[in-house]
């Protein structure tokens, strides 16, 4: 948990915040792991330490090894390990899959492309980006701050896309290059703001006492995959788990998508042994996602197991 | 939402010994220290200790030292504090509070709802 | 132990007024300073961190400033619902160590 993986390339500036977070205002030290020697701050040294961040500057392949940090606060000493590992440059275009940051995706609609790790560095734009090596031209591409925009996506956009920068550090330039891989999503999804589908809105719903009773909350959120979507089942203003009755279950029910495509979510509100008292409780079914959220309110009524009607006036 | 819940209030003879609990919510239990301060009409607030619920480490005032013990169960997101050897000085409300150290807000930002306890024979 | 000494004890004020407390520091403590907010039966509520940084949700009437020993927080325009104790709090050295308090009643 608190060990980091980092990579640089040899004759480029590589920085490293340690793994264990601090206020700013605490001490941190830094030292070579396998000889415990302290790391030097002065930045005249082509290694120092500067509070939470190690520089490399430039980096060297014998840099490569794992490093100690101790963030110290007032009371306690918290440990971290950086791992660094420095490449030798590659000769050929190809860019080895351990030089790589995460993939991310994107679509028509967003198709921002961030530079990994840019916001330890002291920079200033504008960003140089490449496609597998190639530099990017042409009215499609925006470099913008510390991402890259690309109009109009196209399948063909896919690839390994490199930032390059210049860290500036007390006058002296140093390059950083940063690779990842961006990937084309074919569907075209939309998020919209939840619609309940059921229940209606004040529905009655009439149940036998001492029966069970199932209530489904069921909502739809736009076309395709979505980011961040829920369904569920409140008591009286209360979530389910902290409301406390054993007997009132929420369980989720199927993720539908229809044959338009909307992508749908359920959630079964299961009462078992009805009560008197389960009728005074106000009954909400919430559908929320980042566009916000929307109630519809239910309340049971008493069915009586017999319900004959008089034919008399 | 993040919330501090603490355990009743306590009534106890001097001499004994009293266990507070404070049961976090509504957010990552081990990302924050936890910390115990005292508060009395006399002195105000007093700094008992903190703990660090993802370690167990503890920290402590040298004033409350030998004293208070800190604990912290994982499983249960539940700080605990025992305070030994109570007399009438000890007599406060006793408030556990969630300390932001790794991001800021820093500072202690959210608290319980403070516990009285009344050491009296 | 940092001493953190805060004036006044009392603030008796119109709603309307400018207030200021202010707190030192026995020996520096950077800027590690927070200012916390007590309502009668109610738990302290953190309104300033960093010494001058608000909280969220405070509101922009209540203000902090200062570094090293000398801090000083302010209540621009005194509202009827800011009728509580304030605190200041030092967490550069430990034992961590607040102020005396200060009350603040309305007219």
């Known amino acids: 948990k608190f060990s980091k993986q980092s990579w640089g390339l040899e004759n480029e500036a590589l920085i490293v915040r340690c793994p264990r977070q601090g206020k700013p205002s605490y001490t941190v030290d830094w030292y070579y792991s396998q000889t415990n020697k302290s790391i030097p701050t002065q930045e005249r040294n082509r290694v120092f330490a500067s509070g939470q961040l190690l520089k490399f500057l430039p980096a060297a392949v014998a840099d490569s090894g794992i490093y100690t940090c101790i963030v110290r606060s007032p009371t306690f000493n918290r440990t971290g390990y950086a791992n660094v590992t420095i490449y030798k440059k590659q000769s050929d275009c190809n860019v080895p899959d351990y030089l790589m940051y995460s993939t991310v995706s994107g679509s028509e609609k967003n198709s921002k492309i961030y530079c990994p790790t840019i916001d330890l560095y002291n920079w200033t734009a504008p960003l140089e980006w490449f496609k597998n090596c190639q530099a990017l031209q042409g009215s499609r591409y925006r470099a913008h701050k510390s991402f890259l925009v690309i109009d109009n996506v196209m399948t063909e956009d896919a690839g390994d896309y490199t930032c390059k920068f210049i860290h500036n550090e007390n006058g002296a330039n140093y390059s950083v290059t940063a690779t990842r891989s961006f990937t084309v999503k074919d569907e075209q999804g939309f998020s919209l703001f939840p619609v309940i589908g059921a229940p209606a809105q004040n529905e009655i719903k009439e149940v036998e006492i001492g029966k069970n009773a199932n209530l489904t909350c069921s909502a739809c959120f736009g076309k395709g995959t979505q980011f961040l979507a829920a369904v569920l089942w409140q008591l009286n203003g209360t979530k389910i788990t902290d409301f406390g009755e054993p007997r009132i279950q929420q369980e989720e029910g199927q993720n539908q998508s229809f044959s338009n495509g909307l992508a749908c979510l359920d959630m079964v509100l299961r009462i078992a042994d009805v009560k008197e008292e389960d009728l005074l409780l106000q009954y909400d079914c919430l559908a929320l996602n980042l566009h916000g959220l929307r109630r519809h309110t239910v309340r049971l009524s008493r069915k009586n197991p017999i319900d004959h009607h008089s034919i008399y006036c | 939402q993040v919330q501090l819940q603490q355990s009743g209030a306590e009534l106890v003879r001097p001499g004994a010994s009293v266990t507070l609990s404070c049961k976090a919510s509504?957010?990552?239990?081990?990302?924050?220290?936890m910390h115990w301060v005292k508060q009395t009409p006399v002195h105000g607030l007093d700094w008992i200790g903190t703990?660090?619920?993802?370690?167990?480490?503890?920290a402590y005032n040298q004033k409350f030292k030998g004293r208070a013990t800190l604990t912290a169960d994982k499983s249960s997101s539940t700080a605990y504090m025992e305070l030994s050897s109570l007399t009438s000085e000890d007599s406060a409300v006793y408030y556990c509070?969630?300390?932001?150290?790794?991001?800021?807000?820093?500072?202690?930002?959210?608290w319980g709802q403070g516990t009285s306890v009344t050491v009296s024979s | 132990d940092v001493v953190m000494t805060q004036t006044p004890k009392f603030l008796l004020v119109s709603a309307g007024d400018r207030v200021t407390i202010t707190c030192k520091a026995s020996?520096?403590?950077?800027?590690?300073v927070a200012w916390y907010q007590q309502k009668p039966g109610q738990s302290p509520k953190l309104l300033i961190y960093?010494?001058?940084n608000r909280y969220t949700g405070v509101p922009d009437r209540f203000t902090g400033s200062g570094y090293g020993t000398d801090f000083t927080f302010t209540i621009n325009t005194v509202q009827a619902e800011d009728l509580a104790v304030y605190f200041c709090?030092?967490?550069?050295?430990?034992?961590?160590?607040f102020g005396g308090g200060t009350k603040l009643e309305i007219k």
């Open positions: 709090q030092q967490d550069y050295s430990s034992p961590y160590t």
């Open positions: 960093y010494a001058s």
């Open positions: 509504g957010y990552t239990f081990t990302d924050y220290e």
């Open positions: 509070t969630r300390y932001s150290y790794t991001n800021s807000p820093y500072g202690m930002d959210y």
């Open positions: 020996q520096s403590v950077s800027n590690d």
């Open positions: 703990i660090d619920p993802e370690t167990g480490d503890t």
